[in-house]
Amino acid sequence: AESCTSRPHITVVEGEPFYLKHCSCSLAHEIETTTKSWYKSSGSQEHVELNPRSSSRIALHDCVLEFWPVELNDTGSYFFQMKNYTQKWKLNVIRRNKHSCFTERQVTSKIVEVKKFFQITCENSYYQTLVNSTSLYKNCKKLLLENNKNPTIKKNAEFEDQGYYSCVHFLHHNGKLFNITKTFNITIVEDRSNIVPVLLGPKLNHVAVELGKNVRLNCSALLNEEDVIYWMFGEENGSDPNIHEEKEMRIMTPEGKWHASKVLRIENIGESNLNVLYNCTVASTGGTDTKSFILVRKADMADIPGHVFTR
C-alpha cells in the first residue's frame, strides 16, 4: 500500500498530477458505510466540499484525492473528514519554470562521496500502472539508458557525476498526456569521515509564550559522534532556577552520523525571560553552528511576521 501523506505542509509544481492520501486508510475500508468527505478552504472560501463535479481535474478514490493536474488555484487548505477523524494539509502550488526541465524549489539535494556507491532510480509507485515511459535527464540533457520504464544509474561516484538529475515520468489519463518530474541535485564531495555538523530548522525562532506558563525549546543537530550540542543563555548559565537543560538524546542515522537533540525547559516564564536570546550551539573540531530562540509574549505577536514563529 502506498504510504499516506503525513506531511502537513506540501509544495507542488503546477501542471503535474498530484494526490493526497489520508492516514486512516485501513480504518476507512473497515467502515465502508461511514460518510467520508474532502473539503478545501482558501482565502474567502471556507470549507467547500470537493467532489468530481466541482472540477473535472479532481478525482476521488477510496483514501485518495487526485488532481489531474494540480494548478496554481488549487493552493489552500485541504481536509479529510470521516466520523471523528480529521486530517488537514496546507498545499502550496508553485509556478513551473518554463525555461528549464525542472523547478528549482522542488529539488532534493544529495551529497555523495567520491568513489562511493552512487545510485539514482526513477520510480513512482503511486502512478506506476499509468506510466508509459520514463526518461532520465542530467542537467536537462536526456541520458540514453537501457530501461525506459525505470531508468537507473548505479556506479561508483566520480566528480564528473555532479549535476541535476531529473526523472520525468510520462503517463496518460483520460486521453491526456501528463508528466511528473523529480529532480535531484547531486553534489560529489571529497572522501571524508566527518561531516560538518548542522543544526536542524530555522536559525532564528520567535516563540509565542504566556507569562507564568512553561515552554520547551527544541534543538536538534546532525553531527559526528565526538561533537557536542549545548545551550547558552543569560550572562551566567545556571543562574535562573526556572531554566533546565534536559539530557541529550542521540539517534544514529543509516549514514553512521547522529541526530542529537537537547531540550531547554523554561518553567514559570517571567518578564526576564522575554526578548532575550537562548542560543543552541553545536560544536566540532571543524567549527560551530548556532540557532537562537527568542520568547515573545503572545499579545505582542502581531508585531512580528507570521513566518518567523516556530511550530
Epitope: 503525513s6 506531511r7 536542524l200 530548522g201 520547551r216 527544541n218 534543538c219 536538534s220 559522534e225 534536559e246 538524546m249 539517534i251 544514529m252 542515522t253 543509516p254 549514514e255 553512521g256 541526530h259 537533540s261 531540550v263
Partner: antibody, heavy 119, light 107 residues
Framework: QVQLQESGPGLVQTSQTLSLTCAIS??????????WNWIRQSPSRGLEWLGR?????????HYAVSLKGRLTINPDTSKNQFSLQLNSVNPEDTAIYYC?????????WGQGAMVTVSS | EIVLTQSPATLSLSPGERATLSCRAS??????LAWYRQRPGQAPRLLIY???NRATGIPARFSGSGSGTDFTLTISSLEPEDFAVYYC?????????FGGGTKVEIK
C-alpha cells in the same frame, strides 16, 4: 507514565499487507526526546529491529535494509500514534510485533501483538 | 551489521547467587550497548543503557561494564524475578542489533 499499545489483526494471509497501530499515552509522537520504533521477535530470528520514525524539525524514517521497500512507518500526530505497514507478507513474518520508544536505548515497550501469517 | 554474541547460552544458578553475563560485538560499538530482561509472556525491559547506566527504576543489584567489543552484565544477588532471558543490544553502528540471549534458570 509513558505507555504504548499495539493493535491490529492477529492473522494475515500470505502476500497480503500487515497493518499495526501503536497508540502512545504520556508522551508525544512528535517529541524531540524520543524516536518511535517497531521491533519483532520470533523463535527463528530472535529480536529484530524493523524501523523507526521521529520528528526533528521534520519527520525522519529509517528502515532495516532487509525490509526496505516492503515496510512503511507513518506517524499520525492527530491521534498521537504511529503505524506499521508490511507488504507482501510470508510465513517468516510470523512474530510478536512490539512498538517501542527509543530514549535511553529502547526504554518503553508495548505489550506486543502476536501476528500469524497463514498460507 | 554488528553481530552480538552472548555467553553462556544458559546459566544455572540459585537465588542469592551472583550472575555474570557476557556480550561480545563483532566490531567496536563504543559504549552504546544496552541490556534487557525478558520474563516469559512479557516484553523486554530495559535494565542498563550506554554500557553502565541503570535505567529508571532498576535496582542497584544490576550493573553493567565494558566498552568497545566486550561487555558484562552483573547481577550481584539473584532475586526470584531475575530468572529470565537477558539480551544485549547495540546502537553504536548501523543498524541496531540484538544478541541471541542468555537464559538464567534456577539450579
Amino acid at each position: 507514565q509513558v505507555q504504548l499499545q499495539e493493535s491490529g489483526p492477529g492473522l494475515v494471509q500470505t502476500s497480503q499487507t500487515l497493518s499495526l497501530t501503536c497508540a502512545i499515552s504520556g508522551d508525544s509522537v512528535s517529541t524531540y526526546s524520543a524516536a518511535w520504533n517497531w521491533i519483532r521477535q520470533s523463535p527463528s530470528r530472535g529480536l529484530e529491529w524493523l524501523g523507526r520514525t521521529y520528528y526533528r524539525s521534520e519527520w525522519y524514517n529509517h528502515y532495516a535494509v532487509s525490509l526496505k521497500g516492503r515496510l512503511t512507518i507513518n506517524p499520525d500526530t492527530s491521534k498521537n500514534q504511529f503505524s506499521l505497514q508490511l507488504n507482501s507478507v510470508n510465513p517468516e513474518d510470523t512474530a510478536i510485533y512490539y512498538c517501542v520508544r527509543e530514549g535511553d536505548a529502547f526504554d518503553i515497550w508495548g505489550q506486543g501483538a502476536m501476528v500469524t501469517v497463514s498460507s | 551489521e554488528i553481530v552480538l554474541t552472548q555467553s553462556p547460552a544458559t546459566l544455572s544458578l540459585s537465588p542469592g547467587e551472583r550472575a555474570t553475563l557476557s556480550c561480545r560485538a563483532s566490531q567496536s560499538v563504543s559504549s552504546y550497548l544496552a541490556w534487557y530482561r525478558q520474563r516469559p509472556g512479557q516484553a523486554p525491559r530495559l535494565l542498563i543503557y550506554d554500557a553502565s547506566n541503570r535505567a529508571t527504576g532498576i535496582p542497584a543489584r544490576f550493573s553493567g561494564s565494558g566498552s568497545g567489543t566486550d561487555f558484562t552484565l552483573t547481577i550481584s544477588s539473584l532475586e526470584p524475578e531475575d530468572f529470565a532471558v537477558y539480551y544485549c543490544q547495540q546502537r553504536g553502528n548501523w543498524p541496531p542489533t540484538f544478541g541471541g540471549g542468555t537464559k538464567v534458570e534456577i539450579k
